[in-house]
């Protein structure tokens, strides 16, 4: 049976004066020689050799300083061996408890704690929680930390409360005001032994966050400016405001608005984000004849909503702005600024010279009547087709045009006319659009299947050929009306969409015939001039081959009679 005792040892001090700090004996010692051996951490496992045993007596001595934070207790395995080295007892686990001393100060988890809280927050609002640990014995006075605020910057009224036990930093009042102090620095101490022992300090930096608790205020009680009529302005006036909230935030940024006077939407106010000034712009020209002065009322708020602590106090404060409109001799202008003319259908592109489109007069803007004492000239006049009468403003063609002209865009030609005020030399410009019809210069052509036919059976197929896609079949073929006094020699019969049969209605003498043909497409578009077809009628032999020609002296006639020669 083991007989044992073990005294606790205090860390960090010389315990050797209390040696032996433990003793083991076996009651077998009374009858035989027993050797005592010990093992374990602090003996044959690091830290080696802290405890040694007298192998004969079983006295266990401590040889060096121990550290509770490293080894809170030592478990010593004790053996009692007989002369043969055999265990006479079951190995014994002996516990040597190490008593704590207050040799560790509190340690903050951070040297500087950062926190933030909105201004005007309610008292007792949580700002942050400080964290500190102490390596001494847990749940013991040596590791019980008490916190306290050592100092506050800026000094003055204490603004924060630090929970002694939890490390919670809370607001002491509801009067945090960023405009007074935008941040606070607290020096905090944590002391163990519940505030009576070792202490450490840390810093708390608390940012006071801005809320929109200040109204923007105009620096001046009223504003005025002058502007000439008919002009725009990107900066007629600047309004300065004062806002104590944090610069360049939505709590500071001003939003200007009209409360009255801008019903005509002549003005806008834009905020300059660098200076927070309001820039009054004229975005729609003013007319002195209608309005000699404008009385505006303006007000200002912030981009952000006002904070609940002040919103009930906000009133829209209107500030008067007087704008004097200055009369300007306005001179002349084309009203409207452009005019469209249309060339009537059926006019040939070759017969445009002297074709009158109409007049385009400038008006006197002061009287709104046709301007007098002006001279009209053409401005841009691509292709040189048009001319304007310098006095009457009558516009006419001075040149024919090819329907493929590059100056025709979307069936329109564009030109500019100028009105020059003979008093001031000021010029006003109007734009002229001329819509032109489809000139049939490229209308379909008719092609004969053959140049010569026999007088015995004078008939030939006529086909329509189009040069562009402007005309679309089916085509209608007709002969131009011939002079009444002459008998109708030729007839034409449609064969299909693009061809017809031309036939003499009686036997005709050989010769060269000129036949006028009118072609009309499915849209009822037709060539301005009939197409002239030339056909030779000859005397054929029995094989159907042209033989002798007609007498060269035969008088020919137009409209389907033989031609006088070839």
């Amino acid at each position: 049976e083991w007989v044992k005792f073990a005294k606790p040892c205090r860390e960090g001090e010389d315990n050797s004066k209390r040696n032996p700090i433990a003793k083991i004996t076996s009651d077998y010692q009374a009858t035989q020689k027993i050797t005592y051996r010990i093992s374990g951490v602090g003996i044959d496992q690091p830290p080696f050799g802290i405890f040694v045993v007298d192998k004969n007596t079983g006295d266990i001595n401590i040889t060096a300083i121990v550290d509770r934070e490293e080894t809170p207790s030592f478990l010593i395995t004790c053996r009692a061996l007989n002369a043969q080295g055999l265990d006479v007892e079951k190995p014994l686990i002996l516990t040597v408890k190490i008593l704590d001393i207050n040799d560790n100060p509190p340690v903050f988890s951070q040297q500087i704690f950062m926190g933030e809280i909105e201004e005007n927050s309610a008292s007792n609002s949580l700002v942050m929680i400080l964290n500190a640990t102490d390596a001494d014995e847990p749940n013991h006075l040596n590791s019980k930390i008490a916190f306290k605020i050592v100092s506050q910057e800026p000094a003055g009224t204490p603004m924060f409360l630090l929970s002694r036990n939890t490390g919670e930093v809370r607001t002491l009042t509801n009067s945090l005001d960023r405009e007074q102090a935008s941040s606070y620095r607290l020096v905090v101490s944590g002391a163990d032994k519940d505030g009576e022992g070792l202490s450490t300090q840390c810093e708390c930096n608390i940012k006071v966050k801005d809320v929109n608790d200040n109204f923007p205020m105009f620096r001046d009680s009223q504003y005025s400016a002058r502007i000439e009529e008919n002009i725009l302005s990107s900066e007629l006036l600047r309004f300065q405001v004062t806002d104590l909230d944090e610069e360049y935030t939505d709590n500071w940024l001003a939003v200007y608005f009209f409360t009255s006077g801008n019903e005509g939407n002549w003005f806008e106010i834009q905020t300059d984000p660098r200076t927070n000034e309001g820039i009054l712009k004229v975005v729609k020209a003013l007319d002195y004849e209608q309005l000699q002065s404008v009385k505006l009322s303006i007000a200002v708020k912030n981009k952000a909503e006002f904070h609940q602590s002040v919103i009930s106090r906000y009133r829209v404060q209107s500030t008067p702005v007087t704008i004097q409109v200055i009369n300007v001799r306005e001179g002349i202008a084309f009203r409207p600024a452009s005019k469209t003319f249309t060339v009537q259908k059926g006019i040939s592109s070759k017969k445009l010279v002297d074709y009158i489109l109409g007049t385009y007069q400038a008006i006197d803007e002061d009287t709104n009547k046709a301007a007098s004492n002006v001279k009209y000239v053409m401005g841009r006049n691509d292709g040189g087709y048009l001319m304007i009468d310098s006095k009457t403003a009558e516009i006419k063609f001075v040149k024919n045009m090819n329907r493929d002209s590059t100056f025709i865009v979307n069936k329109t030609i564009t030109a500019e006319v100028l009105a020059i005020d003979e008093y001031t030399g000021k010029t006003s410009t109007g734009t002229v659009y001329v819509r032109v019809p489809d000139f049939n210069d490229n209308c379909p052509t008719a092609v004969l299947e053959k140049d010569a036919v026999c007088s015995s059976s004078p008939s030939v197929v006529v086909s329509a050929r189009t040069l562009n896609n402007r005309y679309t079949g089916p085509y209608t073929f007709a002969l131009e009306d011939q002079p009444v006094k002459l008998p109708a020699v030729w007839s034409i019969t449609t064969l299909n969409a693009t061809s017809a049969l031309l036939r003499a209605q009686e036997q005709i003498p050989p010769g060269v015939y000129h036949i006028s043909l009118v072609l009309t497409d499915s849209q009822n578009n037709r060539c301005e001039m009939p197409r002239s077809l030339t056909l030779e009628v000859c005397q054929c032999d029995n094989r159907g081959i042209c033989g002798t020609s007609y007498p060269t002296t035969s008088p020919g006639t137009r409209y389907g009679r033989p031609h006088s020669g070839r």
């Epitope: 080696f48 050799g49 040889t63 060096a64 550290d67 934070e69 490293e70």
Partner: antibody, heavy 127, light 110 residues
């Protein structure tokens, strides 16, 4: 478990400065140990350079004291050796080790030993 | 020149007993604990004996040590081939700090 790993820039020129770092992993450098540097020239015996406690206290080999600086970096859990004005005689395998150093009570001797070693790094001094 | 003096080499055959001596002075061996380290080829040293004569857990009882005055010795009985290594004694010197012996190379013959 705790491990030690030496690291450094490799060869050093004569009269230059030898710099080594020992990283401690698996445990804290703030434990109650003495963090030690020991060197071994090729084919020769061990030589104790010096040791440091986490609070910055040091013991240094008197024969090297004028050239040696040992420092501790708690935030990175490592300690370092600087040896200035090196010569070819400083060519060695440099070991970092965890030491136990306890002054004995009256009548008891001092404990001083190393229970954990790094693998060592060879530093050559040559031009 | 090491502060603690060891023989440069010793040898023995398997099964034999060999002894390595370590001599010093009163400022280190005489007044402080002696430690012995084993360094196998290409590895870092490992503690073999602490507090003059104590074996750490895991060290075979073939290794024993003693200290007398200003000298110490390490004995290895039942020699085995894996014991081939360098052996160093070490102690704290109250004036010079830590001191090592010059090391002894143990060769296992045969």
């Amino acid at each position: 478990q705790v491990q030690l790993q030496e690291s450094g820039p490799g060869p050093v020129k004569p009269s230059g400065t030898l710099s080594l770092t020992c990283g401690v992993s698996g445990g804290s450098i703030s434990s109650n140990h003495w963090w030690t540097w020991v060197r071994q020239p090729p084919g020769k015996g061990l030589e104790w350079i010096g040791e440091i406690y986490h609070n910055g206290s040091t013991f240094l080999n008197p024969s090297l004291k004028s050239r040696v600086t040992i420092s501790v970096d708690k935030s990175n859990n490592q300690f370092s050796l600087k040896l200035t004005s090196v010569t070819a005689a400083d060519t060695a395998v440099y070991y970092c080790a965890r030491g136990w150093h306890r002054t004995g009570f009256r009548g008891y001797p001092s404990h001083w030993y190393f229970d954990l070693w790094g693998r060592g790094t060879l530093v050559s001094v040559s031009s | 020149q090491s502060v603690l003096t060891q023989p440069p080499s010793v040898s023995g055959t398997p099964g034999q007993r060999v002894t390595i001596s370590c001599s010093g002075s009163s400022s280190h061996i005489g007044s402080n604990y002696v430690y012995w380290y084993q360094q196998l080829p290409g590895t870092a040293p490992k503690i073999l004996i602490y507090s003059n004569d104590q074996r750490p857990a895991g060290v075979p009882d073939r290794f024993s040590a003693s200290k007398s005055g200003t000298s110490a010795s390490l004995a290895i009985s039942g020699l085995r081939s894996e014991d081939e290594a360098d052996y160093y004694c070490a102690a704290w010197d109250d004036g010079q700090g830590g001191v090592f012996g010059g090391g002894t190379k143990l060769t296992v013959l045969g």
